[in-house]
Interface confidence: low
């Protein structure tokens, strides 16, 4: 049967919800599926089901609910039904799914190179994603970076953050890294999908070292 | 200082009636969730009615539809239970409790309870 | 209307003790669960909504937590004025409902 697969709000303005239509695989024929919800007013529900404002804007199999129909406050119930029958419900406050877009821009700068030459330090830079109004503080995000060598599998995670920009240290110098940020609303929601991810090439000691150096 | 002061309870005989009263001060009544809730002797926490004036929205437990009524009178500050046909089951501490949702919070809960006043309904 | 399944219903502890009590909800309510304590002739007092957040004025070694529709109230060092019962309460969908009481003795 079609189950609710994800919602997701990137900004606390808006949200959507996804499901999936198994309906072509199974024998029985579930006939078109729709989506109803209702909204509580403090402590009660309005006990009145709308149907989804919008099949279109998140694509195929959601709903899509702009900042006309979607308060952070107020808790929601969604369900799915087909031929009249509900066949999934779920219920959450936005707040709860809240799932920001990437960090986006970001860039690198060495900080310092070790005496040995072995080993350097960045600082890592980015921005918060366009649509969180972060000025204004309606979203608070945190942010987590994680690296790892390009030949590597299995990335190193660094302490959730408050800032856009951080250093990471001891980074072997003649390797290749790969550098990547995901961020989520403080103190609720999940984390979004990480950035695009950030090669950091680190060159050879020479290149980092001035000819006076060497007189 | 928000406070709640219920008054109106007593003895009374089963099919009697009472009204009771929860006298708020240090809050809006009008932009609250009024609750009314009842606890017999040595048992638990049983929700009875709501009101919003906000929202002109009442609600009622099951077990006391049809036979309660509840009010508020905003200029007052002040909301009220009305018992009719009152049953031995009815017997308990009723307490009135405000659950104040423009408090900006995710959720805020019941948050403010009275005192409680004792109704007895026996012969 | 949502059942909340509290446990134990009562326990024996000491000063010092670490103390959890849970409550199980009989379907989604989202984080809109708050906890009190009541002491005997008194009124419930608040101890925790919206899961695990603390109400102001609570002694920090009381904490709250949610997993699914499991919900935790922890103790972390009891005092002697917490002896008392303590109650879990729903408040996503109406009727309100609480659970059924737990009450916290000196051992």
């Known amino acids: 049967e079609p189950k609710f697969t994800k919602c997701r709000s990137p900004e606390r303005e808006t949200f959507s919800c996804h499901w999936t239509d198994e309906v072509h695989h199974g024998t029985k024929n579930l006939g078109p599926i729709q989506l109803f919800y209702t909204r509580r007013n403090t402590q009660e529900w309005t006990q009145e089901w709308k149907e989804c404002p919008d099949y279109v804007s998140a694509g195929e199999n959601s709903c899509y609910f702009n900042s006309s129909f979607t308060s952070i406050w107020i808790p929601y119930c969604i369900k799915l039904t087909s031929n009249g029958g509900t066949v999934d419900e779920k219920c959450f406050s936005v707040d709860e799914i809240v799932q920001p877009d990437p960090p986006i821009a970001l860039n690198w700068t060495l900080l310092n190179v070790s005496l040995t030459g072995i080993h350097a330090d960045i600082q890592v830079r980015w921005e918060a994603p366009r649509n969180a109004d972060i000025q204004k503080g309606w979203m608070v995000l945190e942010y987590e970076l994680q690296y790892k060598e390009v030949n590597e599998t299995k990335w190193k995670m660094m302490d959730p953050i408050l800032t856009t920009s951080v250093p990471v240290y001891s980074l072997k110098v003649d390797k290749e890294y790969e550098v990547r940020v995901r961020s989520k609303q403080r103190n609720s929601g999940n984390y979004g999908e990480f950035s695009e991810v950030l090669y950091v090439t680190l060159p050879q000691m020479s290149q980092f070292t001035c000819e006076e150096d060497f007189y | 200082e928000v406070q709640l002061v219920e008054s109106g309870g007593g003895l009374v005989q089963p099919g009697g009636s009472l009204r009771l009263s929860c006298a708020a001060s240090?809050?809006?009544?009008?932009?609250?969730?009024i609750h009314w809730v009842r606890q017999a002797p040595g048992k638990g926490l049983e929700w009875v009615a709501s009101?919003?004036?906000?929202?002109?929205?009442?609600s009622y437990a099951d077990s006391v539809k049809g036979r309660f009524t509840i009010s508020a009178d905003t200029s007052k500050n002040t909301a009220y239970l009305q018992m009719n046909s009152l049953r031995a089951e009815d017997t308990a501490v009723y307490y009135c409790?405000?659950?104040?949702?423009?408090?900006?919070?995710?959720?805020?809960?019941?948050?403010?309870w009275g005192q409680g006043t004792l109704v007895t309904v026996s012969s | 209307d949502i059942q909340m399944t509290q446990s134990p219903s009562s326990l024996s502890a000491s000063v010092g003790d670490r103390v959890t009590i849970t409550c199980r909800a009989s379907?989604?309510?989202?984080?809109?669960v708050a906890w009190y304590q009541q002491k005997p002739g008194k009124a419930p007092k608040l101890l925790i909504y919206s899961a695990s957040s603390l109400y102001s004025g609570v002694p920090s070694r009381f904490s709250g937590s949610r997993s699914g529709t499991d919900f935790t109230l922890t103790i972390s060092s009891l005092q002697p004025e917490d002896f008392a019962t303590y109650y879990c309460q729903q408040y996503w969908f109406s009727p309100i409902t609480f659970g059924q009481g737990t009450k916290v003795e000196i051992k």
């Open positions: 009101i919003s004036p906000y929202y002109g929205y009442t």
């Open positions: 379907q989604s309510v989202s984080s809109a």
């Open positions: 409790a405000r659950y104040y949702y423009w408090s900006g919070g995710r959720f805020s809960a019941i948050d403010y």
């Open positions: 240090g809050f809006n009544v009008y932009y609250s969730y």
